[in-house]
Interface confidence: low
């Protein structure tokens, strides 16, 4: 059959070379002459040549030695073609399997290794691990296992089989009893390394053991008892370095101190910790001491190691009585943040409230008052009462100085001490809101056809708050009602300007009063433009070119010319009577709106 | 006229403080706040900070555990300090008025600067 | 912080030329409140102080001649010199005063050519 079983070579094969591996044949050549070719990495692509076959007899050929730790395996195809070039069977596997042979030692992954270990540590304890690695096949055969061994221990007191190594694992640990640091600090030992699971070749590296101290010595107090002064009211103030001597070694974790409060300290005013150089506790304050309160503390201090102790020691303890020294102390705002309620633009004079301020002091001391931030300059304060009164217009919809209704005042209050103390309190005015703006109308310019005009929607505005807003009312002043209307909407919160009769193209002012639901009334003139134009519109078109429609008949131009001197001198005769002088562009819009009455019957 | 005048030491070693004083005139420092903005040689500004007229302070953050700006109204100084100085700190330092104190003046824009004063840092 | 970013960096005109110069924030600068665009620019010339030209992105400093003109909303912006002088020579910058710490553009230098 066209099968070729997985074919087994050793590495490192002496030859020699070609060396015949497997014979390829195909029961096809009965029929016709076979040529044999094989490809795959190792024949035609790289590593090319590694492999070859005769071309007529079909024997697989190994061509140099092979490197399993290179290349464990290659997957080859064999092909068969008849003379003319056409295959006559499907590509063939040809698996290669390299077997290994003991070409490699053992490497340890570093020259020298660290650990430590407690003195005086049970037999067991585990020190360190050390890892060496062996290139060999470690699956198939013990070229590449390796066994783990001490040669050699320096020194070798109190004897020369302290440690041990496991075969398999490389984990050092401690064999015997009796390890002293203050005797031996530090072991050296040798390892070895073997492959064929400790039958075959060897390396050595070096493993150092340190000899830790442990925790044998309880640290002490020098002295027992301290006495310090403190001011009050200061945090983070350091009140006193306590002093220990360990005899364990310096800066280990059996000699590092840990400080403890143990008593005296029920208000949790002090904390202590230990000073990273001179292993020294320093006693601060965590909170400020209150010389009214109590003017002396005695606190316990016990101290002990960072490390727990190897044997049953006593644990010392610290006194130190903390003397409270009185200073002069801040007046307090009550409460430090007030929220008051104040109408805006109440008159100036108007008292807005009394924010007064305490001294912790027991000396009965004389607090004077001032305005530290007024941002707007609304207010003044009574230095003696803490009376806070109105100077300016508090106006809540001023958004420069007001977020919220609320204007931010910080005041400051003075005590007559040596030397004097400030505190300073926050006062929130909350501004309640009245009636002092009218409704404004959005946009104040508009531009609208004469001719089929669509009405302009307005927004309206009004600073104030509910119930000083909407719904509002709306109504034309100064004669703007004879061509235009203004309508509030249902929701009562836009106005609809309509132009209601004919105007030339030109600009014009519509005055529209706007009222609130207070009845507070704001007049404001809209800019208006009208264009010659049908319908909506937003910039005016070139100049309005009239016309007079068909034929354009002598007649009809007569008529025009009497109708508009009839206007003109109606027009003289109204503007004597009763018109005033700022109706003077409606009028001249009313003649042409007759030439255009006129103008559309002629047609 | 409003003037406002740079004072500073030209040369400092790093790691050690530069105190700048920023001396004004035609103005008084309870109406304007006054910035500091440095500019390192070839390059362009950076805010520093500013102190307004009441003594508060906004800085960069960037620099502002290095920064301090405080202020003597009557003397009508301002001053900066800046500590642990490096190289990279060396540049021409500026003091330079608000337009005004509200926001509504565009305090945010600077009107008048100082000549500005050379700091090299340097060893 | 707000990065102000200017562009181009440097251009060479000839006097009488019209120029523009643009900066853009990476965030908005108008402030809804108000309708105000927190944007300044200033001039520095050779050796001198700078010295503001615009506020609110476009309300000229007093003694500021009207050939300056500041425009733009938002994020971008653009400083117009309609006809260039050769006093105009100096860096440009635009500075934000919208949020802390208050940032300046990179500069745009204007060489004469």
């Known amino acids: 059959d066209w099968v070729v079983a997985p074919i087994s070579v050793p590495e490192n094969g002496k030859g020699p070379f070609p060396q015949r591996l497997n014979q390829l044949k195909s029961n096809k050549d009965r029929d016709t002459k076979i040529f044999y070719s094989i490809t795959g990495p190792g024949a035609d692509s790289p590593p090319e040549g590694v492999f070859a076959v005769e071309k007529e007899t079909g024997w697989l050929l190994l061509n140099k030695p092979l490197d399993r730790e290179e290349i464990a395996k290659y997957e080859l195809f064999g092909h068969a073609v008849s003379e003319n070039g056409a295959s006559v069977e499907d590509p063939m596997n040809i698996s290669i399997i390299v077997t290994d042979q003991n070409d490699h030692k053992p490497k340890f992954t570093q020259d020298t290794f660290r650990g430590s270990v407690l003195e005086g540590v049970l037999p067991g304890t585990s020190v360190m691990q050390v890892t060496a690695t062996d290139e060999d096949d470690a699956i198939y055969t013990y070229n590449g296992v390796v066994a783990y061994s001490i040669h050699s221990q320096e020194p070798k007191d109190p004897h020369d089989l302290m440690f041990t190594i496991h075969r398999s694992t490389g984990t050092i640990s401690v064999i015997s009893s009796g390890l002293d640091r203050e005797k031996v600090p530090e072991y050296t030992l040798t390892i070895q390394a073997t492959d064929m699971d400790g039958d075959g070749s060897t390396t050595t590296a070096v493993a150092v053991v340190e000899i830790l101290d442990a925790n044998d010595n309880a640290p002490m107090f020098e002295p027992q008892k301290y006495e310090a002064w403190v001011p009050e009211n200061e945090v983070g103030h350091e009140v006193q370095r306590l002093t220990v001597t360990d005899l364990d070694v310096p800066n280990s974790p059996a000699w590092r101190a840990t400080y403890h409060i143990v008593g005296g300290d029920d208000g949790d005013h002090f904390t202590i910790t230990t000073h990273p150089e001179t292993n020294q506790g320093v006693l601060t304050t965590k909170k400020g001491l209150d010389f009214e309160a109590q003017d002396q503390h005695t606190l316990y201090v016990e101290v002990t190691n960072e490390a727990p102790f190897a044997v049953k020691l006593p644990t010392a303890t610290a006194t130190v009585v903390v003397h409270v020294k009185d200073v002069n102390e801040a007046p307090v705002f009550v409460p430090p943040s007030k929220v008051v309620e104040v109408q805006e633009g109440i008159p100036t004079g108007e008292p807005v409230c009394v924010y007064t301020a305490e001294d912790p002091d027991k000396e009965n001391q004389k607090i004077s008052y001032r305005i530290l931030r007024d941002p707007a300059g609304w207010l003044a304060m009574d230095p003696d009462s803490g009376q806070v009164t109105a100077v300016g217009t508090l106006d809540r919809e001023d958004e420069q100085f007001v977020r919220n209704n609320i204007y931010e005042v910080m005041v400051l209050a003075m005590d007559n001490g040596s030397p004097p103390t400030t505190g300073t309190g926050t006062l929130l005015l909350t501004l309640i809101d009245v009636n002092d703006h009218g409704p404004v109308p959005e946009p104040r310019q508009i531009t609208i056809c004469n001719q089929s005009p669509v009405r302009q929607v307005l927004n309206i505005t009004d600073k104030d708050l509910s119930p000083h807003t909407s719904p509002f009312q709306a109504q034309l002043t100064d004669d703007s009602d004879i061509y235009w209307t203004a309508e509030v909407n249902e929701e009562g919160d836009t106005v609809v300007l309509s132009l209601k009769k004919f105007l030339k193209q030109d600009t014009y002012d519509v005055h529209l009063s706007l009222s609130d639901h207070g009845n507070k009334e704001q007049l404001t003139v809209i800019r208006a433009t009208v264009c010659d134009c049908h319908g909506h519109v937003e910039t005016c078109p070139g100049p309005w070119k009239g016309g007079s429609g068909g034929g354009g008949s002598g007649a009809g131009v007569i008529a025009v010319i009497v109708v508009v001197v009839i206007a003109i001198v109606a027009g003289i005769v109204v503007l004597v009577i009763s018109r005033k002088k700022r109706m003077a562009k409606y009028e001249k819009a009313e003649i042409k709106e007759m030439g255009e009455m006129h103008r559309e019957l002629n047609a | 006229v409003q003037l406002l005048e740079e004072s500073g030491p030209g040369l400092v070693a790093p790691s050690q403080s530069l105190s700048i004083t920023c001396t004004v005139s035609g103005f008084s420092l309870t109406s304007y706040p006054i910035n500091w903005v440095r500019q390192p040689p070839g390059k362009g500004l950076e805010w520093l900070g500013v102190?307004?007229?009441?003594?508060?302070?906004n800085y960069n953050s960037a620099l502002k555990s290095r920064l301090s700006i405080t202020k003597d109204n009557s003397k009508s100084q301002v001053f900066l300090k800046m500590t642990s100085l490096q190289t990279d700190d060396t540049a021409r330092y500026y003091c330079a008025k608000s337009r005004g104190v509200y926001d509504f003046d565009g305090r945010g824009a600077m009107d008048y600067w100082g000549q500005g004063t050379t700091v090299t840092v340097s060893s | 912080e707000l990065v102000m970013t200017q562009s181009p960096s440097s251009l060479a005109v000839s006097v009488g030329e019209k120029v523009t110069m643009s900066c853009k924030s990476s965030q908005s600068l108008l402030y809804s409140s108000n309708q105000k665009n927190y944007l300044a620019w200033y001039q520095q010339k050779p050796g001198q102080s700078p010295k503001l030209l615009i506020y609110?992105?476009?309300t000229r400093e007093s003694g500021v001649p009207d050939r300056f003109t500041g425009s733009g909303s938002g994020t971008d912006f653009t400083l117009t010199i309609s006809s260039v002088k050769a006093e105009d020579l100096a860096v440009y910058y635009c500075?934000?005063?919208?949020?802390?710490?208050?940032?300046f553009g990179g500069g745009t230098k204007l060489e004469i050519k």
């Open positions: 500075q934000q005063y919208y949020s802390y710490p208050y940032t």
């Open positions: 102190i307004w007229t009441g003594g508060g302070t």
């Open positions: 609110w992105a476009s």
